[in-house]
């Protein structure tokens, strides 16, 4: 190939052309979480299914030990939904008792760990106060955005309370990324 | 330029190169729902506007009878938002009356029907308890993720209660998919 | 029909091939909002960080004065999350006092301004009633979808109340777009 046949004069090629089917991609789905040690003031990371059911990794995008490993530098769209469920927050009771009413909350963070920076970077956060009247509550938090990642970066999903995560269905709680 | 100089040795092309503008894509927007028969234990499917206003289908992605029809196998990003609105859930009243407090809920499911599997597959679910203090409530549920689809697959959006869907504005309730 | 309709004569190239790394892209992050005049019945627009931290613009996608400027016609995926936080809505108090209970609400709109149309177009809206029991509440609204845009179009994010926007962290409130 001489590379000319599709190259209109207005369009200089600044980067190699890519077959779209060859790009790193992953969609991970929830599994039951085994309790793991996590450090104070640090949200625990979820682990994921990567090959059964709707889950997959392809084109050198690998999943290992709670992390998606970025095999190639570029701009990625990253997304996650976590469905939480729990019993009534103490919120309304606290309020009635006249004590200061700090609502409970649920939080999801998509975090990047990179060789080039000592601290993890929070890419996306969804956080919501939970102050429900009903005795049982459930709700999702969805996040998604585009980021420039480097080969070797690692992505994980952290949550404020792993025991509140709904792990019952692969369509309720998930995590994915794909190279644009 | 001979087009070769940017072709790193690690990057063989495993799939045909595609012009991005030629990929199947659709963005559908809400319309007023006509009551349709739906069967017990099965959430009703929404139908959609596919050509007026912000809505479009292109490159062989077709819409027919509640379904987006997938014309080509590949990895698709699929998304939907449904805005719900209603009067107060009975939740708080039930609570005050001392009856068991099972909250009402709102649910959106993006479902795939495929001829390579005999039953529908739930790809994405957003479900939320609704137990509001105010007399009128409204809120969106957003979903989006990437899935590997086959030529001939059909996608639809199901909701727990079609009468609660806000059909008044095309920017509030929508459904889309595009080949990556 | 004999089942041929999807047979891959579709692999002809109908549009110029593009190097993916050359496509217009932006991810903008929240900054503290300076009070600006906005007109009655018109939601104020947020302004954004476009180069520090996680924020970037590239390949002729420019940010200026609250707007993302679209440099090239095509189909774009556009997204935003706005995290709101506030003190208790008056909702429950109003209810107890027997006054008509119109709930407070929070709203995000992604708006397109185009030369070819005199009025701004609302592309995406997320709107939610807020009627919280707790004294302090916070929650995100996420939006994302695909739209066909024209060179010269401008995108902005409008909110119902700029004073409720959480501007404290770049991962909580953001706005982005990329050419597909």
């Amino acid at each position: 190939l001489k590379g000319q046949e599709f190259a209109p004069s207005h369009q200089q090629v600044y980067a190699p052309l890519r077959a779209d089917g060859d790009k790193p991609r992953a969609h991970l789905t929830v599994v039951r979480q085994t309790p793991t040690q996590h450090f104070k003031n640090q949200f625990p990371a979820l682990h994921w299914e990567h090959e059964l059911g709707l889950a997959f990794t392809k084109n050198r995008m690998n999943y290992t030990n709670k992390f998606l490993l970025i095999p190639e530098s570029g701009d990625y769209f990253i997304y996650s939904q976590v469905t939480f469920r729990g019993m009534t927050s103490e919120c309304s009771e606290i309020r009635q008792a006249g004590r200061p009413n700090k609502p409970d909350s649920i939080t999801v963070v998509i975090t990047k760990v990179t060789d080039s920076y000592p601290e993890p970077t929070q890419l996306l956060m969804g956080t919501k106060s939970v102050c429900e009247v009903g005795s049982n509550w459930f709700q999702p938090i969805y996040l998604g955005a585009m980021f420039s990642l480097q080969e070797g970066d690692k992505l994980m999903v952290n949550v404020s309370d792993i025991s509140l995560v709904d792990y019952t269905k692969e369509d309720k709680t998930f995590f994915g990324a794909f190279l644009l | 330029l001979k087009g070769q100089e940017f072709a790193p040795s690690h990057q063989q092309v495993y799939a045909p190169l595609r012009a991005d503008g030629d990929k199947p894509r659709a963005h559908l927007t809400v319309v007023r729902q006509t009551p349709t028969q739906h069967f017990k234990n099965q959430f009703p499917a929404l139908h959609w506007e596919h050509e007026l206003g912000l809505a479009f289908t292109k490159n062989r992605m077709n819409y027919t009878n509640k379904f987006l029809l997938i014309p080509e196998s590949g990895d698709y990003f699929i998304y939907s938002q449904v805005t719900f609105r209603g009067m107060t859930s009975e939740c708080s009243e039930i609570r005050q009356a001392g009856r068991p407090n099972k909250p009402d809920s709102i649910t959106v499911v993006i479902t795939k029907v495929t001829d390579s599997y005999p039953e529908p597959t739930q790809l994405l679910m957003g479900t939320k308890s609704v137990c509001e203090v105010g007399s009128n409530w409204f809120q969106p549920i957003y979903l989006g993720a990437m899935f590997s689809l086959q030529e001939g697959d059909k996608l639809m959006v199901n909701v727990s209660d079609i009468s609660l869907v806000d059909y008044t504005k095309e920017d509030k309730t929508f459904f889309g998919a595009f080949l990556l | 029909l004999k089942g041929q309709e999807f047979a891959p004569s579709h692999q002809q190239v109908y549009a110029p091939l593009r190097a993916d790394g050359d496509k217009p892209r932006a991810h903008l992050t929240v900054v503290r909002q300076t009070p600006t005049q906005h007109f009655k019945n018109q939601f104020p627009a947020l302004h954004w960080e476009h180069e520090l931290g996680l924020a970037f613009t590239k390949n002729r996608m420019n940010y200026t004065n609250k707007f993302l400027l679209i440099p090239e016609s095509g189909d774009y995926f556009i997204y935003s999350q706005v995290t709101f936080r506030g003190m208790t809505s008056e909702c429950s108090e109003i209810r107890q006092a027997g006054r008509p209970n119109k709930p407070d609400s929070i709203t995000v709109v992604i708006t397109k301004v185009t030369d070819s149309y005199p009025e701004p177009t609302q592309l995406l809206m997320g709107t939610k009633s807020v009627c919280e029991v707790g004294s302090n509440w916070f929650q995100p609204i996420y939006l994302g979808a695909m739209f066909s845009l024209q060179e010269g179009d401008k995108l902005m994010v409008n909110v119902s109340d700029i004073s409720l926007v959480d501007y404290t962290k770049e991962d909580k409130t953001f706005f982005g777009a990329f050419l597909l």
Partner: antibody, heavy 116, light 106 residues
């Protein structure tokens, strides 16, 4: 109640065509795919093809490609299968079935006899 | 096309016995489906997606397997289980059935 009701038995001469019908009730055929399967006397099951009633798109087993046509009338929730250029080895019971919704449902079958 | 080979072709057994029948695919498939057919009746869906029992199927039936090798097992034969069992794959076009395993009373 979810069911598929097929048309009655047919006797045809070699070279003729036959058009069988399958009427659905209790579900929307456009939500599913409709298949045709046949079974010659004393033999196993043979898949012939399927139609997507929502779009009219079809997939056929290549061995039937030139002789079979599947169509849909959504207004009556009926699917049709026409087989042309009949020969004696087409003598069989022809079943319609649905996929894409549980339970997987089959019609009662239509006997087609091809004899001179 | 994907060829499915069922074995054995016929099984002669008595009520109360354990039964295992096999379905082997000529190339890998994602799932296997099983149907039961009795004389003069349409086939009935029996096991879907390799291991899920269709509605009304007794739990003495089970399905397993992956790739090219799949199995239907009956833990303890009952008189109503005597029938022909067909496997079917949905992964490749055309869909194909196995030749069937006839389960007859000894």
């Amino acid at each position: 109640q979810v069911q598929l009701v097929q048309s009655g038995a047919e006797v045809k001469k070699p070279g003729a065509s036959v058009k069988l019908s399958c009427k659905a009730s209790g579900f929307d055929i456009q939500d599913t795919y409709m298949h045709w399967v046949r079974q010659a006397p004393g033999q196993g099951l043979e898949w012939m093809g399927r139609i997507d009633p929502a779009s009219g798109h079809t997939k056929y087993d290549p061995k039937f490609q030139v002789r079979v046509t599947m169509t849909t009338d959504t207004s009556t929730s009926t699917v049709y299968m026409e087989l042309s250029s009949l020969r004696s080895e087409d003598t069989a019971v022809y079943y319609c079935s649905r996929s894409g919704g549980l339970p997987d449902v089959w019609g009662q079958g239509t006997t087609v006899t091809v004899s001179s | 096309e994907i060829v499915l080979t069922q074995s054995p072709g016929t099984l002669s057994l008595s009520p109360g016995e354990r039964v295992t029948m096999s379905c082997r695919a000529s190339s890998s498939v994602s799932y296997m489906y099983w149907y039961q057919q009795k004389p003069g009746q349409a086939p009935r869906p029996w096991i879907y997606a390799t291991s899920n029992l269709a509605s009304g199927v007794p739990d003495r039936f089970s399905g397993s397997g992956s790739g090219t090798d799949y199995t239907l097992t009956i833990s303890r034969l009952e008189p109503e289980d005597f029938a022909v069992y067909y496997c079917q794959q949905w992964s490749g076009n055309p869909r194909t059935f196995g030749g069937g395993t006839k389960l007859e009373i000894k």
